[in-house]
Every structure is written in C-alpha cells, then in structure tokens.
C-alpha cells in the first residue's frame, strides 16, 4: 500500500482542516488508514483522524481544531496499521480557505434598486472576520450568457445594485463567495443560491 | 462560565508535605493540558508545573523537580500538586491554570506558608 | 535571574499610550510565541495576549501585542486609571521544557 499523491490540506482559520490524497490503489480509507495530527507545542497531545473515501483510490480526512492562530504549525502522520505511509506538516496560516457565506437574501421592495445580503462566515473574534471580501455572482436562468460577477472589496457584506441593469421580467439567481487578502487565501465554495424574479418600472420615454 | 478552585495550602515545616487541588468547571477538562504558577509575596509569578490533557507528558521547574509531582484525574476534573520536602523558598501563592497556546484561565490561588 | 528581560516599571497619564518591552537573552530561542499577563492589585493573573498578538475575547482593543525576534512588546493606548496593574510577558522555552515568565513590569497611571 503505497500513497500516489501527498495529503494536502487546507484550513478554514476556525475549526477545521481538511486534508485529502490519493492511494496508489482502491483503498478502505475509514478502516484502512488513519491520519495522525498533532500542534507543535510542548503540551499539546496527538489527534487521530479516521478519513473517508474521496473516490476509489483517493481519501479525505476534517482535522478538528480548537482554534488556529498564524503561528501554528502541525506535523501529520498518516498510518496503515503499524506502517507509516507518509510524514508531513501543515501550517494552517498559509492554506486558507475561508468558510462560504451564507443567508444570502435578495431585497427587491428599495424602489428600484436590488440589496442583497449576506452574513459573514465568521465570529467576530475571529482574525478573519473583519479581513474578508467577496464577489457575487448573478445570472439569468433563461440566459446562460448573462452572467455577471460584482466585487465587494468593502468590508460590508451587502451589495446594491439597481434592478435596471438586469433584464426585467425574467428569474434570477445568485450566490456569494469569500477570500482573504491578508493571509492571500484561495476564494470559498459558493454559498447556496437563491432567487428572484426582476421586475421594475421602466422609465416613461420622453417623445 | 470556566472555573478553577484551588484547595489545600496552608501552614507547613519545612521537610513537610502537602497536597493541592485544583476543581475544574465550566470547560471539558480532558481536553486542554494544565499547569502550576506561583508567586512568592512581593515577587514575580514563577512557573512550576504542567501536564498534557491525558497525563501523558508532565514537566516541572528545575526548582522543583524531584520534590513535586503533578497528576489529574480527568474522571473527576481535578488537578493536583503533590509537594514534598517542602523549603521556605516555596512559601507562594499557588495558581492553578488551564493551558491553551497560554495560560487562559487562573483560579484565585491558594497560599503555602513553609515555616517553623 | 529571569531569561526574559522587562523594565520594573513603567508610567503613564490617562489618554496615553505605554509600551512595555519584553526580551529574551542572544541565545533565547525565537521559535516560541509570546503571551502577556495583566494582575491587578490583590488578584489573580489573568490572559492579555496570547501568540504574539491575538487578543482573548472580553480583552479590549486598546491592548495590542507584538514580537520581533526573540523581544516582545505590549503596547496600551488610551491609558485608564484601571490599567494600574502587575504585566508579565512569557513564552514557552522547548530548550528547557518549561515556560518562562518575566519578572514583570508595573505600570502607574499618573494623575
């Protein structure tokens, strides 16, 4: 049994770490295998991860976690039986990837103009919390080439855009992801979508 | 809210013994490694002893070492400091503190007088 | 003798800002992450900062920790008469199996 591609990880600078790679053949990740991790600090004591399938011969394992702080850096051990496969570390600082928004609503009664919201993945106490940005992704369900992407690199997770510069009449979909600068993360998954259908007044043509 | 109640100080001859506890609340103690501190009057805080969250690993100030020793009982949430041959040197207020990366929560200490 | 080195003392007028220093020795390992403790008068220690510069929740703003090297620094801006205190630095020292404290600065708040 032999590992064909190097666990990597990633954290989401919270609670949880997630780790995955690939066996060299089909493998029972849960009852074959166990991922050991363990904080490089003189009281801190080894964890044992029981990863599931990720596909046939790949494997993936969520590390939890108290919190993470930049300094942290862990040492993982991944076993078969009494057989170390692999022996790495993982600081959990520099493979970001934050947690995907959520709650994302559509207000469509501000005369003419659409807000959307969302809420930040993260407590405030939580470094992360006040160094996010996002981009918001609309597109139309009739039309697959209207799609667009907005950045919010303010700190607010809130956009508004005025309803005229969608098509009227017609349903809407959206969604939100985050990154972070600060620690140049990789973006989050996508936040579920929602929608909603546009409508509003056209202005009357002056003759 | 966590926590922590230390118990058993008091008068003591030099050469003596006493035992200090430590009653854990509000957290899950088997979880996060724990630690002694104490503070002589008037003087600095002055580390003494830590173990791992299962008593795997324990280490000790080399003023201590050999004359102390530290257990918990996870079943019970309780840290303990066992203190023989006891010196005026040792005469403190001692702290019981949980560990995380630092020591984040202190009891309110118990105080040690080794005198004759 | 401590390995980390802090001023006895330090002051300040309320509304300041006071920045109290904390070193290691030239062969104090700089591996380790600093923590910094506040005791008021007649109480227990308690956690100010932890890992060089994170704050514990409840701890306000006006505390800020940083490190470069094997020194450390706990800076308080807007001083209050509150802040009248005992403030220990400490790391972990895997060379010692240990952790290490600073023999502590105090602070007054004139005025």
């Known amino acids: 049994m032999k590992v064909l591609q190097e666990p990597t990880c990633v954290s989401d600078y919270m609670s949880i770490s997630t780790c995955e790679w690939k066996m060299n053949g089909p493998t029972n990740c849960s009852t074959e295998l166990r991922l050991l991790y363990q904080l490089v600090f003189l009281l801190s004591e080894a964890h044992t991860c029981i990863p599931e399938n990720n596909g046939g011969a790949g494997c993936v394992c969520h590390l939890l976690m108290d919190d993470v702080v930049s300094a942290d850096n862990y040492t993982l051990d991944l076993w078969a039986g009494q057989q170390l496969l692999w022996k790495g570390s993982f600081k959990p600082s520099e493979h970001v990837k934050p947690r995907a928004p959520g709650n994302l609503t559509v207000h469509t009664n501000v005369s003419d103009t659409l807000l959307l919201t969302w809420s930040n993945p993260y407590p405030p106490d939580n470094y992360l919390y006040n160094h996010l940005t996002y981009a918001v992704n609309i597109w139309s369900e009739n039309d697959p080439a209207d799609f667009r992407i907005y950045n919010v690199t303010y700190l607010e997770p809130s956009l508004r855009i005025a309803a005229s510069t969608l098509k009227s009449g017609i349903s809407y979909r959206a969604r939100v992801r985050a990154w972070a600068q600060c620690y140049n993360t990789t973006w989050s998954e996508w936040s579920p979508s929602t929608k909603w259908h546009n409508s509003y007044r056209e202005p009357f043509e002056q003759h | 809210e966590v926590q922590l109640l230390e118990s058993g100080g008091g008068l003591v001859q030099p050469g003596g013994s006493l035992r200090l506890s430590c009653a854990a609340s509000?957290?899950?103690?088997?979880?996060?490694?724990m630690a002694w501190v104490r503070q002589a009057p008037g003087k600095c805080l002055e580390w003494v002893s830590a173990?791992?969250?299962?008593?795997?690993?324990?280490y000790y100030a080399d003023s201590v070492k050999g004359r102390f020793t530290i257990s918990r009982d996870n079943s019970k949430n309780t840290l303990y400091l066992q203190m023989n041959s006891l010196r005026a040197e040792d005469t403190a207020v001692y702290y019981c503190?949980?560990?995380?990366?630092?020591?984040?929560?202190w009891g309110q200490g118990t105080l040690v007088t080794v005198s004759s | 003798q401590s390995v980390l080195t802090q001023p006895p003392s330090a002051s300040g007028t309320p509304g300041q800002r006071v920045t109290i220093s904390c070193s290691g020795s030239?062969?104090?390992?700089?591996?380790?992450?600093f923590n910094w403790y506040q005791q008021l008068p007649g109480t227990a220690p308690k956690l100010l900062i932890y890992?060089?510069?994170h704050r514990p929740s409840g701890v306000p703003d006006r505390f800020s920790g940083s490190k470069s090297g094997t020194s450390a620094s706990l800076a308080i801006s807007g001083l209050r008469s509150e802040d009248e205190a005992d403030y220990y630095c400490?790391?972990?020292?895997?060379?010692?199996?240990?952790?290490?404290l600073g023999c502590g600065t105090k602070l007054t708040v004139l005025g």
């Open positions: 890992a060089d510069s």
């Open positions: 173990i791992t969250s299962s008593g795997r690993s324990i």
């Open positions: 509000g957290f899950t103690f088997s979880r996060h490694a």
């Open positions: 400490g790391t972990w020292d895997y060379s010692l199996s240990g952790y290490v």
């Open positions: 503190a949980r560990v995380h990366r630092a020591f984040d929560y």
């Open positions: 030239p062969l104090f390992p700089d591996s380790g992450s």
